[in-house]
Structures are given as C-alpha cells and as structure tokens.
C-alpha cells in the first residue's frame, strides 16, 4: 500500500494473507473473506498454472504478518476460466477452505455489491494489504497491515489516461468493463496487495468493489490502480459460494 | 506413541455393506485431515478418500463416489468407511493413514484391514 | 484428474547400484511424494515435497524434479532398500498414486 497509514486493529476483519510454502509460510497475495468457507482473491495470484493444495495456505486477518499465524488449509483452487493475464480481465479466483472460519468481531466476511451498484467517483473506499509501500520497497516489519482511502475514477477517463504514453491505438480499450480503476500519485495498491479487497462504504455497509488486479508500477502518473470490478463476476461467484441465507 | 488401528473388515457378498473403523490414539486427532487408501492383491496403492479436520470437506475417488461414505467422530478419536454395493473389484486391503499438518504427506499409517467381496 | 506414470515398473540391480524411479504427471504440478512398502507391510513415508526426507529416511536417498518429471534416486542401493516406491501427487482432489515400482535384487 502506498502512501496511508497502518489499519487499525478493528478494521476490515475480511482481510487475509496467502501464504505459498518455501523456507516459511510467506505472503505472496491478499484476498477476502466472503463466506466462512470462501475467500476470493485474484487469479494472477494462484494461476494459471494452479499450485497444489499442499503449496498454499490462508492466514486470517492479523495486524502484523507472521506473528500470531494460524495457518489455513484449501480444499479448492478455482481461477476463472476466462483468466489468462490481468491486463485481459477476468483477473478474480475463489478459494475454499477446508473448515468454515468461527465468526468473530475480529473476523468476518466481507458484504459483496449488489449487481446495480456502480461505485462512482466520490464514494468513500479504501484498499488494505501487506504490499509494498512503494516501487521496489517492501514493507518493512512489523508488517503491519495498511490501509489508503483511494479516490474512484470513471473507466473512459482512466483509460484515456493508460493511453497517454502508450503504444495501444486510442481505439483499443486498455481499462475493460470489468475493471474498475481507483488511486493517484500518492495513493495506490502495490504489488504484493495483488488479491486483496477494495471496498466502498455505502448506506452504512462496506462492500467490496473490486479486487486488486494490476496497474503500472504504483501510484504513477496517469496510472491509477485497476481492479477486477465485482459486480461483473457475481454471478460466478454465486455459482460456487452460497449467498447469506 | 502415535497409532491407527483399522478394524471391520471381512467376507461380504456382491452388493453388500461394510463399515470399516480406525481408532486413533497418541495425537490430537480433531486437529488433523485423515485419508483411505486401499491395495488390491498384487497391485498398488490406490487413495480412496479424505475428510478434513473438522468433517466439513470430504472428497472420493470418482469409482467410488456414491457408493462409500468417509466420516470421523472426534469425540471418539475414530475415522470410518462405510461401504456399500460393495463389488468384486473392491477386494482390498484398506489402509487409514493422517495427512502431516503441515506438509500434507500421509505420515502415519495403520497395519491394514482386508476386506474380501466374494459370492 | 491428474495421472501419475512411474517408470520403470520393476528393476533388478545389486548392491551399490545408483538406482533412479521416474514419475510422470499428466500435468504439471508443485510437489512429488514418495512411499516405501515391503511385502506384507503398511506403507512408509519417504520423501516430502519433492526432495524432503521423512524421518529416519537415510541420506542416500533424494528426490527431485519438477513440473510434470519427478525422480526417486538411491545413491548407493543397499539390502534394505529392496521394496516397492510409489510416487503420489498433492495438487488437487481426487488424490492419485503412481503404479509403483518394485526394485528387486539382480
């Protein structure tokens, strides 16, 4: 997370770490909890070519990585099966946990968007994660977990501004309509966030809008942070995890 | 000392029921997922199921998905199979061994039950 | 479902022979384990996450390989190593083994 400031011990209680197995459990994504048994993260973290079961574990919402882990088993990597790079879409994956999460104050499911919210510029969101806090600079231990309010920007402007300096013809979209961009020059997602929520309080209730997918570099000029817009893959979602009763 | 000690196997008709149990004792059981596997006369090892920790997650072999049941009781230290339209092909010796905790390899496994379908 | 194809499916070799076992993946996958079982035994476990040696295991045996091509090598064979090598995946249900391979004495 560029710029921000380290979350507050109560705050986004959906918020975990995956972990893939080498010398130890280290962070490698974020993801949320949307159901006791489901996390969604993105699926550049965990494809195309899907780690084993035995490679991958879930940490629940902790305020400093690797001080408290207890780590979590998945029974189900399912990476959309339209995912081939971010840039193209379809950058979201679900993972199953082998035992439902106990619900507490301190851990719970996020609420997903209904289809016809949009989430346009102005509304308050905010991206959490424990990626690096600038290009090429990790965060530094505690590792505490992050938190930025990032400003939404409209698809067509963000888009006009991923053309500004590139190669791709003004005609060919760069920002899809199942992105979503979000973040400025001092405020953005950054690698290692990959996977994680963005969410947006609206009528009193955070929802997650997106899921952290790419950009270029973090918190660039005319690059803002772009995520997998949620609304576009409910359905999919809905094909695996139950809805709240 | 860490055991699994499988029992209820036997001579059972085409078509028949079986439930096989395994008792374990030396370790937290409620803490690990627990697998079957079985070997055929002669022939390899073959995985037949697995149930997580908590009983929440349970996965077959295609062949015998419908047709076997893997469930524990924690409360009892004990993982079971129920079998049943048991076939000839189904004649094995039938193995209950733990997934490590944290490396998912079947560190633990018991001495084998045989189980014989046969008319 | 993922195959796993051990090769060869039996081999003879003496004493102090380098013994190598294949496993084959029908696609690609993170980690290999192996299992060692004599006759009228349980299995044992072997190797772990494609080259960790279970306890006990000696060192004159190690593992390798990755993606689809995993190996079991014995540096120098000894009496008791005369048993049967499975090769098994972990990457996603439902779980499978290898066919085996049974390494006897010349």
């Known amino acids: 997370i560029v710029g921000g400031q380290e979350a507050p011990r109560s705050k986004w209680p959906w918020q975990v770490s995956l972990r893939v197995h080498g010398p130890y459990w280290m962070h490698f994504c974020g993801g949320s909890l949307i159901h006791p048994q489901w996390v969604l993260t993105a699926a550049h973290c965990v494809g195309p070519d899907v780690k084993d079961l035995a490679a991958l574990r879930v940490q629940l919402r902790e305020q400093h990585l690797y001080y408290q882990d207890q780590l979590l088993p998945v029974s189900r990597i399912i990476v959309h099966p339209q995912f081939y790079t971010a840039q193209i879409g379809a950058d979201i994956a679900l993972l199953e946990l082998e035992e439902p999460v106990n619900v507490s104050s301190h851990v719970h499911t996020v609420t997903l968007p209904p289809a016809s919210e949009t989430f346009p510029p102005g509304m308050p969101c905010w991206v959490t994660g424990w990626g690096d806090v600038d290009n090429d600079e990790r965060l530094p231990p505690p590792f505490p977990l992050k938190q930025v309010k990032v400003p939404i920007m409209e698809n067509h402007i963000c888009d006009a501004k991923y053309h500004l300096g590139a190669y791709t013809g003004d005609d060919v979209r760069i920002v899809r309509d199942d992105m979503l961009c979000a973040g400025n020059t001092r405020r953005d997602s950054c690698q290692g966030d990959s996977g994680g929520p963005l969410v947006c309080k609206v009528n009193g209730t955070w929802l997650q809008a997106g899921v952290v997918s790419w950009g270029e570099g973090c918190a660039q000029p005319n690059r803002p942070g772009i995520y997998t817009r949620v609304t576009y893959y409910l359905d999919w979602i809905h094909h695996y995890v139950p809805k709240k009763p | 000392e860490v055991q699994l000690v499988e029992s209820g196997g036997g001579l059972v008709q085409p078509g028949g029921s079986l439930r096989l149990s395994c008792a374990a004792s030396?370790?937290?059981?409620?803490?690990?997922?627990m697998v079957w596997v079985r070997q055929a006369p002669g022939k390899g090892l073959e995985w037949v199921a697995f149930?997580?920790?908590?009983?929440?997650?349970?996965y077959y072999a295609d062949t015998m998905k419908g047709r076997f049941t893997i469930s524990r009781d924690n409360s009892k230290n004990t993982l079971y199979l129920q079998m049943n339209s048991l076939r000839a092909e189904d004649t094995a010796v039938y193995y209950c061994?733990?997934?490590?905790?944290?490396?998912?390899?079947?560190?633990?496994w018991g001495q084998g039950t045989l189980v014989t379908v046969s008319s | 479902d993922i195959q796993m194809t051990q090769s060869p499916s039996s081999l003879s070799a003496s004493v102090g022979d380098r013994v190598t076992i294949t496993c084959s993946a029908s696609?690609?996958?993170?980690?290999m384990y192996w299992y060692q079982q004599k006759p009228g035994k349980s299995p044992k476990p072997w190797i772990y996450?494609?080259?960790d040696l279970a306890s006990g295991v000696p060192s004159r045996f190690s593992g390798s390989g990755s993606g689809t091509d995993f190996t079991l090598t014995i540096s120098s064979l000894q009496p008791e190593d005369f048993a049967t090598y499975y090769c098994?995946?972990?990457?996603?249900?439902?779980?499978?083994f290898g066919q085996g391979t049974k390494v006897e004495i010349k």
């Open positions: 061994t733990r997934r490590n905790y944290d490396d998912f390899y079947f560190d633990v």
């Open positions: 030396g370790f937290t059981f409620s803490d690990y997922g």
């Open positions: 149930i997580s920790s908590g009983s929440s997650t349970v």
């Open positions: 696609s690609s996958v993170t980690y």
């Open positions: 996450r494609t080259s």
């Open positions: 098994q995946h972990y990457h996603s249900y439902p779980l499978t």
